[in-house]
């Protein structure tokens, strides 16, 4: 057991341009308070969980009224530490969320109004019993400076607060196998006092006075081996005569988990899965209700209709998680259509649209040809957010304004000569070839591979390409 302590040193404008406006005014005096939420571990799953290590709310700070025209200074802070007691071992790695709240003290109907000013979060490694760790976190234009530490409550000591210490019985040294309790060198690590008679080889305890058996052993003092021979009933008393023993009550029998926690057996003991709002080894630490203000980022707390939902946070847009502590990456849903670029501005989403598209989600395909004329008889063709012109013969370019050289691409085959013509091009074919592009050979006997040439044109004459 122990206490996590958080000391807020300052909350005010961060460095750099764009200093925030003071949150209080002469017309609307206000005061600050802070919330801290702690979760064990560094894993991403922790984001979805409630404040399983605990949460705390500071006292209200002094009332503050902005001096007209003055920049926002460091704001007056509440006195004292924020303390989050923990009953079990200190996990060593933890996640935190610290929120700065403003309480407006104007003439609101129904009492003071609260609003969230800033929220910072992080993941840290911290050994219990160590010195204060200092931190600076920024949230928008605000800066929060704070220190934190975890300390064990006597008689627990150690980096996880799991070792117990007792005053020395002898002045010079500790008993056999027991170390001095650093940093309390005048104390000795105390052995856990298990239930009297508990087998030292086959039993162990995590709490004073208990006796838990290692696998293969049973009985109140873990002195009876579990027989592997066939026994009639799955659970029941042992038979001293046959030596057949079935396991005694399992660690989950009678469900040691309080407050609706469910029990699962582990190799050495049991584990409770607690409903939301409860935590601790046996779910005995009642957690969190709406009165504790568990919803971050302005989430609305309502009481749940089910024991597994002790409270429910209705999150504002942009946040999710059982405590509204997780910022939604709304762009991951790819809301911008037609290749638009998504920008999450916090208070809103914006889509930056590609050329040819418009609308809040780039959903409107602009009429690419509207107001676009293609010159010289060209026709406009829409497509892909851009327009293009299909030009009449003899013209080219984006808007068909350029006169094309139809011979530039050397369209006449087999050495034919190309002549530009007002309506296109004409190929004068080399001897032995014919066709609009001189693509057909003339047969040696004078017969053409094509139908008879039109009247007035002999094979070998220039053919006009129509």
């Amino acid at each position: 057991a122990g206490v996590f302590e958080l000391q807020i040193h300052s909350f005010g404008p961060g460095p750099g341009p764009g200093a925030p406006r003071s949150p209080c005014s002469a017309r609307l005096p206000c005061r600050l308070f802070f919330r801290v939420c702690l979760k064990p571990g560094l894993s991403e799953e922790a984001a979805e969980s409630p404040c399983a290590l605990g949460a705390a709310l500071s006292a209200r700070g002094p009332v503050y009224t902005e001096q007209p025209g003055a920049p926002a200074p460091d704001l007056p802070l509440p006195d004292g530490l924020l303390q989050v007691p923990f009953r079990d071992a200190w996990p060593g790695t933890f996640s935190f969320i610290i929120e700065t709240w403003r309480e407006e003290l104007g003439d609101q109907i129904g009492g003071p109004a609260w609003s969230l000013l800033a929220r910072v979060a992080g993941r840290r490694r911290l050994a219990a019993g160590g010195p204060w760790a200092r931190d600076i976190q920024r949230a928008g234009a605000w800066e929060l400076r704070f220190s934190y530490r975890a300390r064990c409550e006597p008689p627990a000591v150690g980096t996880a607060c799991t070792r117990l210490c007792r005053p020395r019985s002898a002045p010079s040294r500790c008993g056999p196998g027991l170390r001095p309790c650093a940093p309390l060198e005048d104390e000795c690590e105390a052995p856990l006092v298990c239930r009297a008679g508990c087998s030292p080889e086959h039993g162990f305890c995590e709490q004073p006075g208990e006796c838990r058996c290692l696998e293969g052993w049973t009985g109140p003092l873990c002195t009876v081996p579990v027989s592997t021979s066939s026994c009639l009933s799955p659970r029941g008393p042992s038979s001293a005569t046959t030596g057949c023993l079935v396991p005694g009550p399992g660690p989950c029998d009678g469900n040691p988990c309080a407050n609706g926690g469910s029990c699962s057996e582990t190799p050495r003991s049991f584990e409770c899965t607690c409903p939301r709002g409860f935590y601790g080894l046996r779910c005995e630490v009642s957690g969190v209700t709406c009165a504790d203000g568990p919803c971050f980022n302005g989430g609305l707390c309502v009481g749940g209709a089910d024991p597994d939902s002790a409270y429910i946070c209705h999150c504002p847009p942009g946040f999710q998680g059982s405590n509204c502590e997780k910022r939604v990456d709304r762009c991951s849903l790819q809301p911008c259509r037609n290749g638009g670029l998504c920008l999450d501005l916090g208070h809103a989403l914006r889509c930056r649209c590609r050329a040819g598209f418009a609308g809040p989600r780039c959903e409107h395909d602009l009429d690419d040809c509207a107001g676009r004329a293609c010159a010289n008889g060209g026709t406009c063709v829409e497509g892909g957010g851009a327009h293009r012109c299909s030009c009449a013969l003899g013209f080219g370019g984006r808007d068909c304004r350029e006169r094309a050289d139809p011979c530039a691409a050397r369209p006449c085959a087999h050495g034919g000569r190309c002549y530009a013509h007002f309506s296109g091009l004409v190929c004068a074919c080399a001897p032995g070839y014919m066709g609009a592009r001189c693509e057909f050979p003339v047969h040696p006997d004078g017969a053409s591979a094509l139908p008879a040439a039109p009247p007035g044109l002999r094979p070998g004459d220039p053919q006009r390409y129509l």
Epitope: N259, G260, S262, S264, T273, P275, T289, V302, G303, G304, A305, D306, P307, D308, S309, A310, Y311, I312
Partner: antibody, heavy 117, light 109 residues
């Protein structure tokens, strides 16, 4: 909108068996505990059974009147809730409802189970 | 096993305020009982009105409100309407077991 649709009711003889199903849509079924509630003709409501979610090891709870005869189960992959009813008695005759509690109570339309000789 | 008790019947007039209560045999009703209120109209038509003691369901008129009054859970209808005539059940959770009251038949004359 949350939808709960019960099926599987019918006429059965005493000591017989019946399996009720409840198809759930429009919410994250896997996250929540689910319940069966019944109402006998002309009577009030009686809670029958509850099953919690995977993170609570699918723990089950029953009213004393149905313990050891009824089994509640769920298939998260199909968003289905079931109630296997064995050794039915005449007093089990009732309308059976699939019920989900979260911020308030969500009800299905019910399925009628009649136990009669 | 806990017993949950409700008034068997109440009569009110349109526009009047009426309060239905829900008592637990185990002691005071608290928020950890997650009191729920359900309305039953003819043909087995059930509607969840209130969850978690005071959490009104969407679409339920604002005249319905839930609270704890003394050691009981309460459903208050402020300005009853003729369409509010129905049977009202309260349900209380005791750990993972749910117990319903016998229901209150509300008549709006």
């Amino acid at each position: 909108e949350v939808q709960l649709v019960e099926t599987g009711g019918g006429l059965v003889q005493p000591k017989g068996s019946l399996k009720l199903s409840c198809a759930v849509s429009a919410f994250t079924f896997t996250t929540y505990a689910m319940n069966w509630v019944r109402q006998a003709p002309g009577k009030g409501l009686e809670w029958v059974a509850r099953i919690r979610n995977k993170s609570n090891n699918y723990a089950t709870y029953y009213a004393d009147s149905v313990k050891d005869r009824f089994t509640i189960s769920r298939d998260d992959s199909q968003s289905m809730l079931y109630l296997q009813m064995n050794n039915l008695k005449i007093e089990d005759t009732a309308m059976y409802y699939c019920v989900f509690y979260y911020d308030y109570v969500y009800w299905g339309q019910g399925t009628l189970v009649t136990v009669s000789a | 096993q806990a017993v949950v008790t409700q008034e068997s019947a109440l009569t009110t007039s349109p526009g009047e305020t009426v309060t239905l209560t829900c008592r637990s045999s185990t002691g005071a009703v608290t928020t950890s009982n997650h009191a729920n209120w359900i309305q039953e109209k003819p043909d087995h038509l059930f509607t969840g009105l209130i969850g978690g003691t005071n959490n009104r369901a969407p679409g339920v008129p604002a005249r319905f409100s839930g609270s704890l009054i003394g050691d009981k859970a309460a459903l208050t209808i402020t300005g009853a309407q003729t369409e509010d005539e129905a049977i009202y059940f309260c349900g209380l959770w005791y750990s993972n077991h749910l117990v319903f009251g016998g229901g209150t038949k509300l008549t709006v004359l």
